[in-house]
C-alpha cells in the first residue's frame, strides 16, 4: 500500500547480517560447547574454511538436541532468512545437519522457539557438507540473539556454518499487548487470531510478544483472502467483535526499546463493511516513560474521517504530536461490528541520551484497562553496507 509511509517491505529485508563478511565479530558468536578449539563457534561463518571448517558441538545432538550455536546481533533485527552449511575441511568434511531448530530472544532472558505458519518447528537443513541451504522464515523473527540447534536421527557428528539475513528493526517495538483475536462466523469461519504471536496468552490477553501486527504483511481488501499460500481465511488480519467489548473500544499497549518521540502511528485496517469490518471511529493514545510510571498529560485523540464508504483496506495515520514515551496505550473505538487490523507501525525518533531498556523487559502484569489494541510495522534500515538483498524465487529452496 502506497499510503503506508514508513512501512517496511519484508521482501527487501533480506541483507546478510555479517557472519560471512565478518561484521559480526567473533566475540558475538558462541556455543553451548565445541568439539575442539578448531571447531569453535567462531568457525561457524558461512563459506568460511577457518579452523577445521565449521562449528561442531562436543556432545551428541541425538536424542537431546541441546547443543546450540548462538549469534548475538547486538541490536534488534528482523531476521527473514537463514543459510546453513556443513563442515568444509578442505573438501574432506562429511559432517552436516539434515535438520535444525531455531530459538531467538530479544532480551537474552526469554527465549522463543521459531515455528512456521503451521506450527512446524523443525527446519530442513543440508544434504551435504558444502551446499548452502537457505530457509525463508515465514514468519520472520524480531530478535537480537539467535540460536541454531542442529538435529540428528541417530548418534552422529554434526557441524554447522551459518548466515542470517534481514535488516535492522528500527521501529524499536519490543512487544504489543492485545486481546486475543476472534473468529468471525460467515458462511465459513474466518479466523482473526494473531497466529504468529510469540508472547504469552492468558485469560483472553496476549502480552509480551510480537506477531502478525508487526510482520510487515499488509492485508488484502477482502479479509477472507491472504497474501500467504495455504493458510486459512482471515489469516492476514487480527480482529475483534464489538459485541465482545462493553467499553466500545479495543485497547492495546506497546512497549519500545527506549524513549522515543512519536510522530504518528499507522494502522492498516480492513473496511469491508458489507461483512461487518469497519475502520475505527477514533483512536485515543496515552503515553508514559516507564512501566510503573503514571500516564503523562492528556491522551491524544484522533477522530477518523475520510471515505468510510470505500470498502478498500487502508492505512490510517494517527498523529501522535511528538509525545515522548516508552509505553503507549491506545484505544480503538468501534464504528461497526468488527475491527480488523493487519499491521501497526510507528514513526518515531529515539530521544538522544535515552539508554535502551534492560533488554526490553516485560512488566509483571498488565497495568491498563480492558479492550483491544494496535500493533506495529517497522521502519527498517533497508540497505546496510551497500549490499544487495538475497532474492526470493518462487519454488526455490528458500520458499
Amino acid at each position: 500500500d502506497a499510503d503506508m509511509k514508513g512501512h517496511f517491505d519484508p521482501a527487501k529485508c533480506r541483507y546478510a547480517l555479517g557472519m560471512q563478511d565478518r561484521t559480526i565479530p567473533d566475540s558475538d558468536i558462541s556455543a553451548s560447547s565445541s568439539w575442539s578449539d578448531s571447531t569453535a563457534a567462531r568457525h561457524s561463518r558461512l563459506e568460511s574454511s577457518d579452523g577445521d571448517g565449521a562449528w561442531c558441538p562436543a556432545g551428541s545432538v541425538f536424542p537431546k538436541e541441546e547443543e546450540y550455536l548462538q549469534v548475538d546481533l547486538q541490536r534488534l533485527h528482523l531476521v527473514a532468512l537463514v543459510g546453513t552449511q556443513g563442515r568444509h575441511a578442505g573438501g574432506l568434511g562429511k559432517e552436516f545437519s539434515r535438520s535444525y531448530r531455531l530459538r531467538y530472544s530479544r532480551d537474552g532472558r526469554r527465549w522463543m522457539g521459531w515455528k512456521d505458519r503451521w506450527g512446524q518447528e523443525v527446519i530442513s537443513g543440508n544434504e551435504d557438507p558444502e551446499g548452502v541451504v537457505l530457509k525463508d522464515l515465514g514468519p520472520p523473527m524480531v530478535a537480537r540473539l539467535v540460536r541454531f540447534y542442529p538435529r540428528a536421527d541417530r548418534v552422529m557428528s554434526v557441524c554447522l556454518r551459518v548466515e542470517l539475513y534481514g535488516c535492522l528493526w528500527r521501529d524499536g517495538l519490543l512487544s504489543y499487548t492485545a486481546p486475543v483475536g476472534q473468529t468471525m462466523y460467515l458462511s465459513e469461519a474466518v479466523y482473526l487470531n494473531d497466529s504468529t504471536y510469540d508472547g504469552h496468552t492468558v485469560g483472553g490477553l496476549q502480552y509480551g510478544g510480537l506477531g502478525q501486527l508487526a510482520d510487515g504483511v499488509v492485508g488484502l481488501d477482502d479479509f477472507r483472502k491472504s497474501q500467504e499460500l495455504r493458510v486459512w481465511p482471515g489469516y492476514d488480519y487480527v480482529g475483534w467483535s464489538n459485541h465482545s467489548f462493553s467499553s466500545g473500544y479495543v485497547e492495546m499497549e506497546f512497549e519500545f526499546d527506549r524513549l522515543r518521540a512519536f510522530q504518528a502511528m499507522q494502522v492498516h485496517c480492513n473496511n469491508m463493511h458489507t461483512l461487518g469490518a469497519r475502520l475505527p471511529g477514533g483512536v485515543e493514545c496515552r503515553f508514559r516513560r516507564g512501566p510503573a510510571m503514571a500516564w503523562e498529560g492528556e491522551p491524544m485523540r484522533h477522530n477518523l474521517g475520510g471515505n468510510l464508504g470505500d470498502p478498500r483496506a487502508r492505512a490510517v495515520s494517527v498523529p501522535l504530536g511528538g509525545r515522548v514515551a516508552r509505553f503507549l496505550q491506545c484505544r480503538f473505538l468501534f464504528a461497526g461490528p468488527w475491527l480488523l487490523f493487519s499491521e501497526i507501525s510507528f514513526i518515531s525518533d529515539v530521544v538522544n541520551n535515552s539508554s535502551p531498556a534492560l533488554g526490553g523487559t516485560f512488566p509483571p502484569a498488565p497495568w491498563w484497562p480492558p479492550g483491544p489494541p494496535p500493533t506495529n510495522f517497522s521502519s527498517l534500515e533497508l540497505e546496510p553496507r551497500g549490499q544487495q538483498p538475497v532474492a526470493k524465487a518462487e519454488g526455490s529452496p528458500t520458499a
Partner: antibody, heavy 121, light 107 residues
Framework: QVQLVESGGRVVQPGRSLRLSCTAS????????MLWVRQAPGKGLEWIGT???????YYASWAKGRFTISRDNSKNTLYLQMNSLRAEDTAVYYC???????????????WGQGTLVTVSS | DIQMTQSPSSVSASVGDRVTITCQAS??????LAWYQQKPGKAPKLLIS???DLASGVPSRFSGSGSGTDFTLTISSLQPEDFATYYC?????????FGGGTKVEIK
C-alpha cells in the same frame, strides 16, 4: 494446582456489610477477567460484576453502589464488598475466571466451590 | 442492559433423546455466548464458548449454534449424566448476564 477458594460467607443481619474473599492458587489473578456470580436457593445464576486485568470494574445494574469488587495482587485474592445487605441477597456466591476458547471468545472455565451468605435477622 | 431469556424453563426427556434449549438476547450479541451445565450442589461447568467452541473434555454430543439474538444448545443423544440445569451467558469483556436456566429432568 489451579483453583479458586471463596471464603467469608456467614449469617449476617440485614443492613450490615460483609466482605467475601476469593483466593487463587496456581495462576495470577491480575492476568484475567474475574467475575462474581451468585445463586439464591433454588434459583438461577446471577452475574454480580467483573474486574478486568487492568482493574476496570463492571456491575449489574442492581449491584451498582452496593457491591464493590477489588483485588489484592500481593495476596492473589479477589474481594467482593457487600453493603446494606438484604434478605434477597441470601445466596451462594461464586468467583470465576474468564478464559478464551480456541475461537477467541470468553467463557468461565474455572469456578470456586462457592460460599454461602445468609441475610437474616 | 442486555437481557438473556432461556426457554423452556424445564424439559423432561429420556436417555437417548435429542434435547434442544434456546437462548434469546434482547439485542444482537454476535457470537459472544457461552453455555454451562450445573448439577445440584456443584459449581457450573463450561460447555461451550463463542456459540460453537466446545470446552476441553466436553463430549461431542453437545453442540451450539446461532448468532445475533437467537442461540441453541443441542444434546444429540441424552446420557444419564446430562440431567442437570443449563445456562446461557452473554460474556464479553465486561457486563455478563446469564439466562434464567433450563432444567433437564428425567421423564
Amino acid at each position: 494446582q489451579v483453583q479458586l477458594v471463596e471464603s467469608g460467607g456467614r449469617v449476617v443481619q440485614p443492613g450490615r456489610s460483609l466482605r467475601l474473599s476469593c483466593t487463587a492458587s496456581g495462576f495470577s489473578l491480575n492476568r484475567y477477567y474475574m467475575l462474581w456470580v451468585r445463586q439464591a436457593p433454588g434459583k438461577g445464576l446471577e452475574w454480580i460484576g467483573t474486574i478486568s486485568y487492568g482493574d476496570t470494574t463492571y456491575y449489574a445494574s442492581w449491584a451498582k453502589g452496593r457491591f464493590t469488587i477489588s483485588r489484592d495482587n500481593s495476596k492473589n485474592t479477589l474481594y467482593l464488598q457487600m453493603n446494606s445487605l438484604r434478605a434477597e441477597d441470601t445466596a451462594v456466591y461464586y468467583c470465576a475466571r474468564a478464559d478464551t476458547g480456541d475461537n477467541g471468545y470468553l467463557g468461565l472455565q474455572l469456578w470456586g466451590q462457592g460460599t454461602l451468605v445468609t441475610v437474616s435477622s | 442492559d442486555i437481557q438473556m431469556t432461556q426457554s423452556p424453563s424445564s424439559v423432561s426427556a429420556s436417555v437417548g433423546d435429542r434435547v434442544t434449549i434456546t437462548c434469546q438476547a434482547s439485542q444482537s450479541i454476535g457470537s459472544v455466548l457461552a453455555w454451562y451445565q450445573q448439577k445440584p450442589g456443584k459449581a457450573p461447568k463450561l460447555l461451550i464458548s463463542g456459540v460453537f467452541d466446545l470446552a476441553s473434555g466436553v463430549p461431542s454430543r453437545f453442540s451450539g449454534s446461532g448468532s445475533g439474538t437467537d442461540f441453541t444448545l443441542t444434546i444429540s443423544s441424552l446420557q444419564p449424566e446430562d440431567f442437570a440445569t443449563y445456562y446461557c451467558q452473554y460474556i464479553p469483556y465486561g457486563s455478563s448476564p446469564f439466562g434464567g436456566g433450563t432444567k433437564v429432568e428425567i421423564k
